[in-house]
């Protein structure tokens, strides 16, 4: 807290500029009006200020604006943003993008912070769903935000909003979110051809269904064995060895080097060994032949 | 990757001026400041003043306050350095550097330097 | 305006030492403290920042610490290329400042 000292004279500030930097924190305090640095806002993120300066600057806003800045003052906070508590954000009402670029613009680089957090909720909530531009916008700044999001978060994520969506966007999603992302992805791009289709749902497709994977397998899309390595096991396990085989194309050679990992592993447990065979990969593991295959959900939900 | 270069040597008679410039290249010119730091022969380093390339605008050291005038080009990226009244404690290796913003006023690049001998 | 004196001002140590070196402000600077490495004829090279923060591409033998007043450059162990001058620098207030220097040169 600085101490309350009057002005020395000739020192009162007329214009927020580089003179200021060499006030003492007491003299900024006495000699910068509040009212005068709102409206010049803009010049503060242009000026050297040093983090002890910049901390009294944002005491007089604090003071002049107790409620909360308005977004006028917030769009032109600049580094001064970085000075913010998640508790002084909660009090914002953030409505424009152009708002949220210029505060997200300052943290480029670093990793979210509480701050940015806080700010891009508010903003999100503000604005009832996360809309194309804003999910651009998130996502141009932080790949990994959609993935941070809950799948309850996710469902309110409208279907056009996927296509600002970029593959390293889902890096870090789990089957979960996935499941929540693939029905959105799969109505946004429903309308293109197959290869580009593919191409497109290829990122989303660890939360696809057997029925569409199986769909898929006669399209000759040649999926990659990264990709179906991602799969959900559960959808993998009822394609059979002539369906992988389409799906995956000339990379289904793939498979004998990722014998010992899931997906492939428990799919292989329930393919019959001769079909395996077919393949000429040399895999192992697949039932003997002349064994039945009971498939006891199928029995249960047929009692 | 961000570079400042600056020029060459100069000796100067006492009382002369002397102007030193510093390129910058590698980044948005106009959204760092620049300083000017100087270093006298086996001694430390001392702050001189800062430029705003954006707008011009300066702000100098008090001891410098008088002699030292900082400009810029912006067309060419580059900032100017002008000490005038030279005496022979002004023989020194003059520095440009560039600040971090936001608080962080500290000196991530540096010029090469630039060696000024003030001499009769 | 705010003096930084560091020390020692000079010292003498061997390949693999812990190195430590020390710089005083006459007044609070909070953790406004950058650390510098000078070789002869060239300039400064940035080590580190905010106190205690290593400046990327900065090996990480070289650690920073302290607040307020006190702060200290540690080189946990001395390297053929670390023989040089060291330099604080405050950024809590203008004019900027900085400390005499640490030469260290080989025992």
């Known amino acids: 807290e600085v101490e309350k000292t009057a002005c020395p004279s000739g020192k009162k500030a007329r214009e927020i500029d580089e003179s200021l930097i060499f006030y003492k924190k007491w003299e900024l305090e006495a000699c910068v009006d509040a009212a005068l640095l709102a409206t010049q806002m803009d010049r503060v993120n242009a000026i050297p200020f040093t983090y002890e300066q910049l901390d009294v600057l944002k005491h007089k806003l604090d003071e002049l604006y107790p409620q909360g800045y308005p977004e006028s003052v917030i769009q032109h906070l600049g580094y001064l943003f970085l000075k913010m508590s998640p508790e002084d954000i909660r009090k914002w009402n953030v409505t424009s993008l152009e708002t949220l670029k210029a505060l997200l613009e300052v943290n480029k680089g670093h990793e979210m912070s509480p701050q940015v957090a806080t700010l891009i909720d508010r903003f999100v909530k503000g604005r009832g769903q996360l809309d194309k531009d804003t999910l651009d916008t998130l996502t141009a700044f932080y790949p990994g935000y959609l993935c941070s999001l809950s799948p309850e978060e996710l469902s309110s994520v409208p279907p056009s909003s996927i296509w600002a969506v970029r593959p390293q966007d889902l890096d870090t999603c789990d089957p979960r979110q996935l499941d929540v992302l693939y029905p959105k992805a799969r109505l946004a791009f429903q309308n293109m051809n197959g290869s580009e289709y593919f191409v497109k749902i290829q990122s989303f497709l660890g939360g696809a269904p057997t029925e569409d994977l199986k769909a898929l397998s006669q399209q000759n899309v040649s999926m990659d064995l990264a990709t179906f390595m991602k799969l959900r096991t559960d959808a993998v396990l009822p394609l059979t060895v002539a369906e992988v085989q389409k799906l995956l194309g000339p990379h289904v050679e793939g498979l004998k080097a990722e014998e010992r990992h899931r997906p492939v592993r428990d799919w292989i447990l329930r393919q019959r060994q001769d079909d395996l065979d077919t393949l000429g990969l040399g895999l192992q593991g697949g039932i003997p032949n002349g064994y039945l295959v009971l498939d006891l959900s199928m029995q249960e939900a047929l009692s | 990757q961000v570079q400042l270069v600056q020029s060459g040597a100069e000796v100067k008679k006492p009382g002369a001026s002397v102007k030193v410039s510093c390129k910058a290249s590698?980044?948005?010119?106009?959204?760092?400041?620049m300083h000017w730091v100087r270093q006298a022969p086996g001694q430390g380093l001392e702050w001189m003043g800062i430029?705003?390339?954006?707008?011009?605008?300066?702000s100098y050291a008090q001891k410098f306050q008088g002699r030292v005038t900082m400009t810029r080009d912006t067309s060419t990226s580059t900032v100017y350095m002008e000490l005038s009244s030279l005496r022979s404690e002004d023989t020194a290796v003059y520095y440009c550097a560039r600040a971090q913003r936001g608080g962080s006023v500290y000196f991530d690049y540096w010029g090469q330097g630039t060696l000024v001998t003030v001499s009769s | 305006d705010i003096q930084l004196t560091q020390s020692p001002s000079s010292l003498s140590a061997s390949i693999g030492d812990r190195v430590t070196i020390t710089c005083r402000a006459s007044q609070g600077v909070n953790s406004a403290l950058a650390w510098y490495q000078q070789k002869p004829g060239k300039p400064p090279n940035l080590l580190i920042y905010d106190a205690s923060s290593l400046e990327s591409g900065v090996p990480s033998r070289f650690s920073g610490s302290g607040s307020g007043r006190d702060f200290t450059l540690t080189i946990s162990s001395l390297q053929p290329e670390d023989f040089a001058t060291y330099y604080c620098q405050q950024f809590s207030s203008y004019p900027l400042t900085f400390g005499g220097g640490t030469k260290v040169d080989i025992k």
């Open positions: 430029i705003n390339p954006s707008g011009g605008s300066t």
């Open positions: 590698g980044y948005t010119f106009t959204s760092y400041y």
